[in-house]
Interface confidence: medium
């Protein structure tokens, strides 16, 4: 429905608080280097303007699109050229090219300082002194570091962030109350950001059809009692929501997400029996809850799929009539019967089915040609099952840290050109699949593990896209969204790689390592491990283990020494020499 003033429409729908928060998120995701105060000023100006439009929708400029209004506002930033370089050229363009230009300049790895958590008392004072500014700062800092963070979900995180401070700043032991909550929010936030980044990559790199296929599979698993009609409607609406958020249309996205949650709750009887509790919650919690809701029970006595999709003589006629609808129904029917499969596996099966029909429906005897199509599924199903079994066994044997190290070595050998920080980050996250998924029974392992790996490998893909260094990474990332994980799994040691020159500085450590958290210390050691493999890609597991054990002993020894710095200097030289000898460097 057309509104005279889009900005007034969204302001009224969302309310002032959410409107301001979403505009701040949008601006921070576009201009990631701008100071907080500058963004707050821009947001206040937009909000005041929106209020004039609410009062009179015919007022000057109120009929302009949100992209025009927001883009004009961003282009008033005085230091645009100095801070952002060529992004300033976007401002010479007209809409919609200008917004596309801003989107292309979003940086997945912005050069921003790590967020350091102040002392609890300092945070509580800041919270009490100016709660509004404190919460805005949270939105700003997350949004600029995660330019694709799902905006309506960030509002939910901010609500929980506020609740944590409200409760814990009054507690007897503030730190004991607050720190675990902040850790949980940080970890959940990183996971949420990565999941949304995959959705945006899916839409932007592979198109709406790819996203819709993913959504059909996932929603059919989650709502197996819902009819195809209902799933199709939800997929259409969900695609609109994510297209908007990934496109920077955060006000429309949040508004449409609220409408979708309302629809789902009004029609839960025909969608899922698991939605009751979610639907009793306030809006932000409700939307989050629906997005995370457990799979409903499968209807009893679902008939075999073979009759309709293989044995029927009408398969080619039905396929030709409306290809995507027919394939959508196949995916829906297969997915609702298989909550034990990963979404990417279901999509591989659907792709195999599609390829078979394309070939067979042009053959002399189509039915004879596609009669055995379901047999082709067997190896596709067994491959991830076997991989997960092997890796869960390895995880149980090694524990998380050493399992991460095994993956670090594996991936550094596959793609040694990738930067060390990226290899460490991605391999550490790949390694978390063990503690996240291996505890589950067999029926839940594959959807947990393979769909999580898709999210992590997408991080590698988006980071690599910024500065491409490996043709193999580019190939695995761009050829097929659903085959990314099998593509990386199939990579062997890169025989074309010329080992990195040895640099003693890379392996020089100082006393500051002793004051680091356990996690930070692990990252230091894992960084050294990647560098070792880059220097000696043919090193055996045993050689690398010996060097890493020596390294761990060296750090432990020097951190206990009276003169730590001297110990690191002297013992470090010995360690480097011994490592070189052990690895034949």
């Amino acid at each position: 429905d057309a509104h005279k003033s889009e900005v007034a429409h969204r302001f009224k729908d969302l309310g002032e608080e959410n409107f301001k928060a979403l505009v701040l998120i949008a601006f921070a995701q576009y201009l990631q280097q701008c100071p907080f105060e500058d963004h707050v000023k821009l947001v206040n100006e937009v909000t005041e303007f929106a209020k004039t439009c609410v009062a009179d929708e015919s007022a000057e400029n109120c009929d302009k699109s949100l992209h025009t209004l927001f883009g004009d506002k961003l282009c008033t930033v005085a230091t645009l050229r100095e801070t952002y370089g060529e992004m300033a050229d976007c401002c010479a363009k007209q809409e919609p090219e200008r917004n596309e230009c801003f989107l292309q300049h979003k940086d997945d790895n912005p050069n921003l300082p790590r967020l350091v958590r102040p002392e609890v008392d300092v945070m509580c004072t800041a919270f009490h002194d100016n709660e509004e500014t404190f919460l805005k700062k949270y939105l700003y800092e997350i949004a600029r570091r995660h330019p694709y963070f799902y905006a309506p979900e960030l509002l939910f995180f901010a609500k929980r962030y506020k609740a944590a401070f409200t409760e814990c700043c009054q507690a007897a032991d503030k730190a004991a109350c607050l720190l675990p909550k902040l850790d949980e929010l940080r970890d959940e936030g990183k996971a949420s950001s990565a999941k949304q980044r995959l959705k945006c990559a899916s839409l932007q790199k592979f198109g709406e059809r790819a996203f819709k296929a993913w959504a059909v599979a996932r929603l059919s698993q989650r709502f197996p009692k819902a009819e195809f009609a209902e799933v199709s409607k939800l997929v259409t609406d969900l695609t609109k929501v994510h297209t908007e958020c990934c496109h920077g249309d955060l006000l429309e996205c949040a508004d449409d997400r609220a409408d979708l949650a309302k629809y789902i709750c009004e029609n839960q009887d025909s969608i899922s029996s698991k939605l009751k509790e979610c639907c009793e919650k306030p809006l932000l919690e409700k939307s989050h809850c629906i997005a995370e809701v457990e799979n409903d029970e499968m209807p009893a006595d679902l008939p075999s799929l073979a009759a309709d999709f293989v044995e029927s003589k009408d398969v080619c006629k039905n396929y030709a009539e409306a290809k995507d609808v027919f394939l959508g129904m196949f995916l829906y029917e297969y997915a609702r019967r298989h909550p034990d499969y990963s979404v990417v596996l279901l999509l591989r099966l659907a792709k195999t089915y599609e390829t078979t029909l394309e070939k067979c429906c042009a053959a002399a005897d189509p039915h004879e040609c596609y009669a055995k199509v379901f047999d082709e599924f067997k190896p596709l199903v067994e491959e991830p099952q076997n991989l997960i079994k092997q890796n869960c066994e390895l995880f149980e044997q090694l524990g998380e840290y050493k399992f991460q190290n095994a993956l670090l070595v594996r991936y550094t050998k596959k793609v040694p050109q990738v930067s060390t920080p990226t290899l460490v980050e991605v391999s550490r996250n790949l390694g978390k699949v063990g503690s996240k998924c291996c505890k589950h029974p067999e029926a839940k392992r594959m959807p947990c593990a393979e769909d999580y790996l898709s999210v992590v490998l997408n991080q590698l893909c988006v980071l690599h896209e910024k500065t491409p260094v490996s043709d193999r990474v580019t190939k695995c990332c761009t050829e097929s969204l659903v085959n990314r994980r099998p593509c990386f799994s199939a990579l062997e040691v890169d025989e074309t790689y010329v080992p990195k020159e040895f640099n003693a500085e890379t392996f020089t450590f100082h006393a500051d390592i002793c004051t680091l958290s356990e996690k930070e210390r692990q990252i230091k050691k894992q960084t050294a491990l990647v560098e070792l493999v880059k220097h000696k890609p043919k090193a055996t597991k045993e050689q690398l283990k010996a060097v890493m054990d020596d390294f761990a002993a060296f750090v432990e020894k020097c951190c206990k020494a009276d003169d730590k710095e001297t110990c690191f200097a002297e013992e470090g030289k010995k360690l480097v020499a011994a490592s070189q000898a052990a690895l034949g460097l």
């Epitope: 009819e227 195809f228 009609a229 199709s232 409607k233 259409t236 025909s270 008939p303 009759a307 309709d308 999709f309 029927s312 009408d314 398969v315 006629k317 039905n318 009539e321 409306a322 609808v325 027919f326 959508g328 129904m329 029917e333």
Partner: nanobody, 128 residues
Framework: QLQVVESGGGLVQAGGSLRLSCAAS????????MGWFRQAPEKEREFVAG?????????DYADSVEGRFTISRDNAKNTAYLQMNNLKPEDTAVYYC????????????????????WGHGTQVTVSS
């Protein structure tokens, strides 16, 4: 929610014709089976005709209308039709359009329970 709206009913003399239309609001209309049912005063609702989800792949008719009524659909317009010829006074009833999701190979069910979405009906009166 999927909306179903019937139209085309009216008063007609015996032996005459009417064409009922059923418009569905969803763009995925192609993925549904379509059925026409009718309910005469003091009688139970009964199956009249059905068509499976792809253009005329399978049609089915009640014995009482076979040869006189023709069901068809236009996927591009999200609309289904019931062409009723040689109408009889016993065809007088409220005619309901119903839409169902079902597997593509199946016949359009005669059972009311297999249809999820229903219109409010359109009155057809055949005078003698």
């Amino acid at each position: 929610q999927l909306q179903v709206v019937e139209s085309g009913g009216g008063l007609v003399q015996a032996g005459g014709s009417l064409r009922l239309s059923c418009a569905a609001s969803e763009r995925t209309f192609v993925a549904y089976a379509m059925g026409w049912f009718r309910q005469a005063p003091e009688k139970e609702r009964e199956f009249v005709a059905g068509i499976s989800w792809f253009a005329g792949a399978t049609t089915d008719y009640a014995d009482s209308v076979e040869g006189r009524f023709t069901i068809s659909r236009d996927n591009a317009k999200n609309t289904a039709y019931l062409q009723m010829n040689n109408l009889k006074p016993e065809d007088t009833a409220v005619y309901y359009c119903a839409i169902s999701h079902q597997l593509p190979g199946g016949r359009p069910g005669r059972d009311m329970d297999s249809y999820s979405y229903w219109g409010h009906g359109t009155q057809v009166t055949v005078s003698s």
